[in-house]
């Protein structure tokens, strides 16, 4: 019986060009975490395996950094990074737990947004 729960950072926002940490935490289970997969919609971003360590997908190597912990750091954010991210915890003996994070990447600061609409 799977008793664990995944806690995530939920819905988060960050500025274009900045960075963000995606974090999930598995609680309420004594199951052993064997691997955590990080996915963005239909793309595998990274894997952290208990024995093999981190694998970052080559196409994301420049903008994705492992950690902290089992989390993932996204750098040099673009508006195209907006969307759903999933942490998939593979555990023994429970099986698989999945957490969801929605990231919104904002064009720029509120001040800059405001400046666009000033009346000349």
């Amino acid at each position: 019986m799977m008793t664990g729960t995944i806690e995530t950072t939920g819905n988060i926002s960050a500025e274009k060009g900045g960075s963000i940490i995606l974090q999930c935490h598995l609680s309420s289970t004594t199951a052993q975490v064997t691997q955590v997969n990080w996915e963005q919609q239909d793309q595998l971003l990274a894997i952290c395996n208990a024995d093999l360590g981190w694998h970052i997908s080559p196409s994301f190597k420049d903008r994705v950094a492992p950690g902290p912990g089992l989390g993932l750091t996204l750098q040099s954010l673009t508006v195209n990074d907006t969307g759903e991210y999933f942490c998939i915890y593979h555990t023994y003996p429970d099986g698989t737990y999945t957490g969801r994070i929605f990231l919104e990447v904002l064009e720029s600061s509120v001040a800059e947004h405001g400046a666009r609409f000033q009346i000349p």
């Epitope: 691997q35 239909d42 024995d51 997908s57 023994y92 003996p93």
Partner: antibody, heavy 118, light 107 residues
Amino acid sequence: EVQLLESGGGLVQPGGSLRLSCAASGFTFSSYSMHWVRQAPGKGLEWVSAISGSGGSTYYADSVKGRFTISRDNSKNTLYLQMNSLRAEDTAVYYCARVPYSVWMDYWGQGTLVTVSS
Amino acid sequence: DIQMTQSPSSLSASVGDRVTITCRASQSISSYLNWYQQKPGKAPKLLIYAASSLQSGVPSRFSGSGSGTDFTLTISSLQPEDFATYYCQQSYSTPLTFGGGTKVEIK
């Protein structure tokens, strides 16, 4: 250098048994999931079974479930496939493969031929 | 079970040709799709993993793309040593499944 060497294949009668072995070297065996894949003569690839690095989790294709047993001895760096109640349709070359992150099969053995015939 | 459908099942091409092989999954498999090359009497060899990552030591003329249900293997300029059979394989869920294979023959 990563090496996988299968052995144990041969001719067996229907209903008989065989045990295949896959000797691994050149990497930390216990860190990797290992799989068996087979290929019938002139046919495509068919996944057979998998086992986690610790041996705690095992998986089987429906076609072999209840007849085949995958196991490993990490102290001997060896993977096994015990095949019972063999049928003519089990005739194939059997390959073992290393599977990092349980996602891709990056190294394969040379294969061992199992022929089930009376 | 997830079915993997490869097309074409065979093709004839000349050295220097651009070759494209497609693979379709019966349900979304994210990017858990691998491509293998197999020559007669030999074990399969990993070319592309996780849909688009080139395996170490594989020539850059091989590339993979796609996500979800539709995937493509492209050989940008076919070389004599590329005449072989190519298989896609999903690792999204067990049972793992392979496509039926595409045999690339000399025209």
